[in-house]
C-alpha cells in the first residue's frame, strides 16, 4: 500500500477519505485506526456503526468521527480540532470477522496555523517526506481563505 | 526473554576491515527495523543507518555511506554491520536498536554495543 | 540534515530538583522527537517518544512537551538514579539525528 498524505491546520478540521470498492466490501464495518510506528500494531480509534445499514451515521470518538458511503464507496474520517499529537500513521480498514483488509494508508501532518502569530517564526512550509518519497500529498484544509489571502501550504 | 545480542570487542589495524553481528531473541527481527548507532569515547551518538530485515531495504546516514555496509540474515535473526578502511575515527562503541520505524514506535531494544577499537 | 542543539550541555542540580532540558530542530519535526537517557557503560535507553509520551516503565517524573521546533525535557524532584547522560532524537525524516547531549550532575 502506497501512503496517502493528508495536511491539516492546527486548531482546524480535517477531512480524510477512503475510497474503496463497494462491492468488494458489500457488508463490511469499516474502521480508522492509529499505527505505532511504520511496522507497528495498528490501534482502533473509532468504527462504523454495527449495524452496517447504518453505517452512513457519524460515530464519535472523542475529536474523531467516521462515516461510510457505502454505496459510493468512500469512507470518511474527520479529526476536529487538529492538534500536534494527531500527527502519525494511519489506516482506514475494512473489517471481516477477525481480520482487517487495509483500504488506505494515511500519514497526517499538522501545519501550525499561519493566522496564529504566536507561531509566525515557526511555520511549517513541507518539502519532501523522505519516508513516503512516493506519497501522494491531500491537502486538505477545511478553513476557507480570507479575501486576498496566499493559500497555504504553497503548493508546487 | 526480549534481547539483541552483539558479537565482543574488536581490536582491529587501521585500513582493515571488520564485521559486528546482532541477533535477535524473543522477536523477529522481520518485524522490526535494524538501526546502527556509533558512539566515540567520551561523544555523543551518531546514527549510522537502518536496514528492513523484511525485504533488504537500508537507509545511510550520509557521512556513513561507503564506511557501513548494513546486512540481515532471517535466518538467523541476525542483522550485521560491516566497516571498511577504518582509521582512528572509526574507534567507537556500536550500537544495533531495534524499533517499529519513524511515526511513534513503543518498540524500543537495544545491544549492549560492540567495542571496536582502530590500531596503527 | 536537521540539526538537533542541545541545552545545556551539563547541568548540576540538587535532589529534590526540577530539572529542565531543551531541544531545539533546525526544521519543523511535528512531534517526532524522542528523549533517550544514557549511564555509563550502558547502552541509551528510551524515555518519551512522540515529543510527550511515557514509555513502558519510566517513572512519571520525567515529562515532555513542545512541538514544531522546540521541545523540553523535564524532570520533577530529581533522583540519584536520574544521574546521566540526556539526549533527544529526530524521526521527521532520516538521517535520524541526535543532539550533543546534555550530562546531569548532583551538585
Known amino acids: 500500500h502506497n501512503t496517502t498524505v493528508f495536511q491539516g491546520v492546527a486548531g482546524q478540521s480535517l477531512q480524510v477519505s477512503c475510497p474503496y470498492d463497494s462491492m468488494k466490501h458489500w457488508g463490511r464495518r469499516k474502521a480508522w485506526c492509529r499505527q505505532l510506528g511504520e511496522k507497528g500494531p495498528c490501534q482502533r480509534v473509532v468504527s462504523t456503526h454495527n449495524l452496517w445499514l447504518l453505517s452512513f451515521l457519524r460515530r464519535w470518538n472523542g475529536s474523531t468521527a467516521i462515516t461510510d458511503d457505502t454505496l459510493g464507496g468512500t469512507l470518511t474520517i474527520t479529526l476536529r480540532n487538529l492538534q500536534p499529537h494527531d500527527a502519525g500513521l494511519y489506516q482506514c480498514q475494512s473489517l471481516h470477522g477477525s481480520e482487517a483488509d487495509t483500504l488506505r494508508k494515511v500519514l497526517v501532518e499538522v501545519l501550525a496555523d499561519p493566522l496564529d502569530h504566536r507561531d509566525a517564526g515557526d511555520l511549517w512550509f513541507p518539502g519532501e517526506s523522505e519516508s513516503f518519497e512516493d506519497a501522494h500529498v491531500e491537502h486538505s484544509i477545511s478553513r476557507s481563505l480570507l479575501e486576498g489571502e496566499i493559500p497555504f501550504p504553497p503548493t508546487s | 526473554e526480549v534481547q539483541l545480542q552483539q558479537s565482543g570487542a574488536e581490536l582491529v589495524r587501521s585500513g582493515a576491515s571488520v564485521k559486528l553481528s546482532c541477533t535477535a531473541s524473543?522477536?523477529?527481527?522481520?518485524?522490526?527495523?535494524i538501526h546502527w548507532v556509533k558512539q566515540r569515547p567520551e561523544q555523543g551518538l551518531e546514527w549510522i543507518g537502518w536496514?528492513?530485515?523484511?525485504?533488504?531495504?537500508?537507509k545511510y546516514a550520509p557521512k556513513f555511506q561507503g564506511k557501513a555496509t548494513m546486512t540481515a540474515d532471517t535466518s538467523s535473526n541476525t542483522a550485521y554491520l560491516h566497516l571498511s578502511s577504518l582509521t582512528s575515527e572509526d574507534t567507537a562503541v556500536y550500537y544495533c536498536?531495534?524499533?517499529?520505524?519513524?511515526?511513534?514506535?513503543?518498540?524500543?531494544?537495544w545491544g549492549q554495543g560492540t567495542s571496536v577499537t582502530v590500531s596503527s | 540534515d536537521i540539526q538537533m542543539n542541545q541545552s545545556p550541555s551539563s547541568l548540576s542540580a540538587s535532589l529534590g530538583d526540577t530539572v529542565t532540558i531543551t531541544c531545539h530542530a533546525s526544521?519543523?519535526?511535528?512531534?517526532?522527537l524522542s528523549w533517550y537517557q544514557q549511564k555509563p557503560g550502558d547502552h541509551p535507553k528510551l524515555l518519551i517518544y512522540k515529543a510527550s509520551n511515557l514509555h513502558t516503565g519510566v517513572p512519571s517524573r520525567f515529562s515532555g512537551s513542545g512541538s514544531g521546533t522546540g521541545f523540553t525535557l523535564t524532570i520533577s524532584s530529581l533522583q540519584p538514579e536520574d544521574i546521566a547522560t540526556y539526549y533527544c532524537?529526530?524521526?521527521?525524516?532520516?538521517?535520524?539525528?541526535f543532539g550533543g547531549g546534555t550530562k546531569l550532575e548532583i551538585k
Open positions: 532524537q529526530q524521526g521527521q525524516t532520516y538521517p535520524r539525528t
Open positions: 536498536h531495534a524499533d517499529h520505524g519513524n511515526y511513534g514506535s513503543t518498540m524500543d531494544y
Open positions: 526544521q519543523h519535526i511535528n512531534v517526532w
Open positions: 524473543g522477536f523477529s527481527i522481520e518485524d522490526f527495523y
Open positions: 536496514i528492513d530485515p523484511e525485504n533488504g531495504d537500508s
